[in-house]
Interface confidence: low
Amino acid sequence: RDKVMSEFNNNFRQQMENYPKNNHTASILDRMQADFKCCGAANYTDWEKIPSMSKNRVPDSCCINVTVGCGINFNEKAIHKEGCVEKIGGWLRKNVLEQKLISEEDLGGEQKLISEEDLHHHHHH
């Protein structure tokens, strides 16, 4: 499982690199960040390291109340600061890995960070 999470972490960070260049990747990351209320891999400062993402910008999907442009010149109090790898990883361990023992391939792939089917079973309250 540690290997799976390491793969997921690497894959998530790789897709962050693609965020400014690929709308399909961006849509997946936006969806995950908004749904899991997280931002970046380890935390929101990861976005500073992405070329062509300015230092004072995170994706709008990091905002607590998402509006167009809310991630530009963001206020730290207005965004989710927790990283997605740990947050989604915890959910995966609890709801997917333990129940389904899914293969590592289900967590990788160029376009899908975790399988759509598993994402769809995430209900947050």
């Epitope: 690929n22 709308n23 961006a26 849509s27 936006d30 749904d35 109340n65 998402v66 209900h123």
Partner: antibody
Framework: QVQLEESGGGVVKAGGSLRLSCAAS????????INWIRQAPGKGLEWVSY????????YYADSVKGRFTMSRDNAKNSVYLQMNGLRAEDTAFYYC????????????WGQGTLVTVSS | DIQMTQSPSSLSASVGDRVTITCRAS??????LHWYQQKPGKAPKLLIY???SLQSGVPSRFSGSGSGTDFTLTISTLQPEDFATYYC??????????FGQGTRLEIK
């Protein structure tokens, strides 16, 4: 300002073909997904197809898969919908729609072009 | 595919009324839910995106709420220009992108 303008609609016999065009202006076209959404007269909205900003990811509704082909030309700020094997149930207004990203909904729509398939 | 169900399918109301339209998804869609208004002979117009964010230029009498599977569009004080058909749409699981069947708002 942002504008999307469809053209190419008309009356065609069942089994025939039409090519719809959508000319975009007022925004950086290559940054946006574009969708085709249709509406049969007096009915609701039905998603038909979308193409990503680079033109390399295209999806279709099951109802048109294998018959319709969507493409785009970023140099001309245009998208196209080639419709073959048209059926009576394809009769609808076809809207070209800008898609900023999944969280934001479809923020700009063209005025629509009517396709009528006669049997 | 995710099915979107709107209720009611039609309703009659008077100017000044508070009106509520609901939309239910067949599975959780987080907040990836949008509302559109369509008037006869016109293209739909985006009112609310992300379940509750007001699209630029849309009057503040329109508001949206909900998360997961249940969503609401509210018009706080109905105006004459608000009589139209309203659609919800999900963009959580795509393709396909799916719409509700529409709610026709008529003058009582």
């Amino acid at each position: 300002q942002v504008q999307l303008e469809e053209s190419g609609g008309g009356v065609v016999k069942a089994g025939g073909s039409l090519r719809l065009s959508c000319a975009a202006s007022g925004f950086t076209f290559s940054d946006y997904y574009i969708n085709w959404i249709r509406q049969a007269p007096g009915k609701g909205l039905e998603w038909v197809s979308y193409i990503n900003n680079g033109g390399y990811t295209i999806y279709y509704a099951d109802s048109v898969k294998g018959r319709f082909t969507m493409s785009r030309d970023n140099a001309k700020n245009s998208v196209y919908l080639q419709m073959n094997g048209l059926r009576a149930e394809d009769t609808a207004f076809y809207y070209c729609v800008r898609d900023p990203r999944s969280y934001y909904g479809f923020d700009y729509w063209g005025q629509g072009t009517l396709v009528t398939v006669s049997s | 595919d995710i099915q979107m169900t709107q209720s009611p399918s039609s309703l009659s109301a008077s100017v000044g009324d508070r009106v509520t339209i609901t939309c239910r998804a067949s599975q959780s869609i987080s907040r990836f839910l949008h509302w559109y208004q369509q008037k006869p002979g016109k293209a739909p117009k985006l009112l609310i995106y992300g379940a509750s964010s007001l699209q630029s230029g849309v009057p503040s009498r329109f508001s949206g709420s909900g998360s997961g599977t249940d969503f609401t569009l509210t018009i706080s004080t109905l105006q004459p220009e608000d009589f139209a058909t309203y659609y919800c749409q999900q963009s959580y699981s795509t393709p396909p992108i799916t719409f509700g069947q529409g709610t026709r708002l008529e003058i009582k």
